[in-house]
């Protein structure tokens, strides 16, 4: 219960806190468990104890082992154990699982990635951040205090993020890196009454007789996956599939496109070889979901020939 796993890389600083807490006034003694040898408190040592903290400046692979901390008060003693493992630096980019801190998940509204264990160190801004070993660049990434903020989070932002900072101890600088995975979760979806973005209600669309014309019915239905969302065209109140005019067809495929996080659908009405009688029809763009149905009506008008001036 009072044992804590800690890990670090050779030649980096590692600071470990005693798993047993006590008042700052309590003394804490540290021992190397295998030998029961006391850890010195003098800062000239590479490994030394400083109250509740055990410092490896820098760490070496041979430092791996179990360390015992005893918190001593006037009335009781509390014992804790720190299981420390120091690993050799990897030559390649991959960060092995055993060096990973807990995974954090973010969303469009909350995309903070905290640098693990940083509060144990004496560091000064700025933090450096890397994703999959590449330094993060661009205005979407902001290193703020002890965390990274990612603007407009996308699923592609998932990955392994490493923070790098400098620990200062009595004027000497030591590098520290820590890596954790970041996953992107969808915001809770919602649906709303359909909003038709195009066409405008009672829009007049100019077309040329004998030419082809396209009308796009575009509507948004909420955010996330929508159970029922559909857009379609009707001619004079009749569905295109029942209208029986082969020149006038809906484009197949109502794929959900997510713009600004909204679930939107497009349906294109293709009129081949526009005829005079097409101008007499009423074209209805319908958007339907569980909240109801919205209809926008379009009419066609003949495009006036362009005057050519010399």
């Amino acid at each position: 219960k009072f044992s804590k796993q800690s890990w670090g890389l050779e030649n980096e600083a590692l600071i470990v806190r005693c798993p047993r807490q006590g008042k700052p006034s309590y003394t804490v003694d540290w021992y190397y468990s295998q030998t029961n040898k006391s850890i010195p408190t003098q800062e000239r040592n590479r490994v030394f104890a400083s109250g509740q903290l055990l410092k490896f400046l820098p760490a070496a692979v041979a430092d791996s082992g179990i360390y015992t901390c005893i918190v001593r008060s006037p009335t009781f003693n509390r014992t804790g154990y720190a299981n420390v493992t120091i690993y050799k630096k990897q030559s390649d980019c991959n960060v092995p699982d055993y060096l990973m801190y807990s995974t954090v998940s973010g969303s469009e509204k909350n995309s903070k990635i905290y640098c693990p264990t940083i509060d144990l160190y004496n560091w000064t801004a700025p933090l450096e951040w890397f994703k999959n070993c590449q330094a993060l660049q661009g205005s979407r990434y902001r290193a703020h205090k002890s965390f990274l903020v990612i603007d407009n989070v996308m699923t592609e932002d998932a990955g392994d993020y490493t923070c790098k900072f400098i620990h200062n101890e009595n004027g000497a600088n030591y590098s520290v890196t820590a890596t954790r995975s970041f996953t992107v979760k969808d915001e809770q979806g919602f649906s709303l009454f359909p909003v038709i973005g195009a066409p405008a209600q009672n829009e007049i669309k100019e077309v040329e007789i004998g030419k082809n014309a396209n009308l796009t019915c575009s509507a948004c239905f909420g955010k996330g996956t929508q159970f029922l969302a559909a857009v379609l065209w009707q001619l004079n109140g009749t569905k295109i599939t029942d209208f029986g005019e082969p020149r006038i067809q809906q484009e197949e495929g109502q794929n959900q496109s997510f713009s600004n996080g909204l679930a939107c659908l497009d349906m294109v009405l293709r009129i081949a070889d526009v005829k005079e009688e097409d101008l007499l029809l009423q074209y209805d763009c319908l958007a339907l979901n569980l909240h109801g149905l919205r209809r926008h009506t379009v009419r066609l008008s003949r495009k006036n020939p362009i005057d050519h001036h010399s």
Partner: nanobody, 121 residues
Amino acid sequence: EVQLVESGGGLVQPGGSLRLSCAASGFTFSSAIMGWFRQAPGKERELVAVIIDSRTTKYADSVKGRFTISADNSKNTAYLQMNSLKPEDTAVYYCAAVGGATTVTASEWDWGQGTLVTVSS
């Protein structure tokens, strides 16, 4: 006046089939979007299937591959073919239609009286 009359409900054993019919009148059937909803005891009414046009149908995940919605414009009738029925399909099934107005909220769909489907051994 819009009228929707459901039929075809009844008691069926798990794994069995039923075909529900919805006879419509009082509106232009070929222009309407037809749907089947259901309401189990103590639960909210949920959409089961909808037919938008002869090429476009939508189904609740729980019935996909088992239920089929269709419509016959010549008979002004919508159908729900239900196969591989499960006890959890037990509910009152309602036929609904939407169309006509510029905006129609969900509560303004036209509804039938419902037909009870009981799946039990």
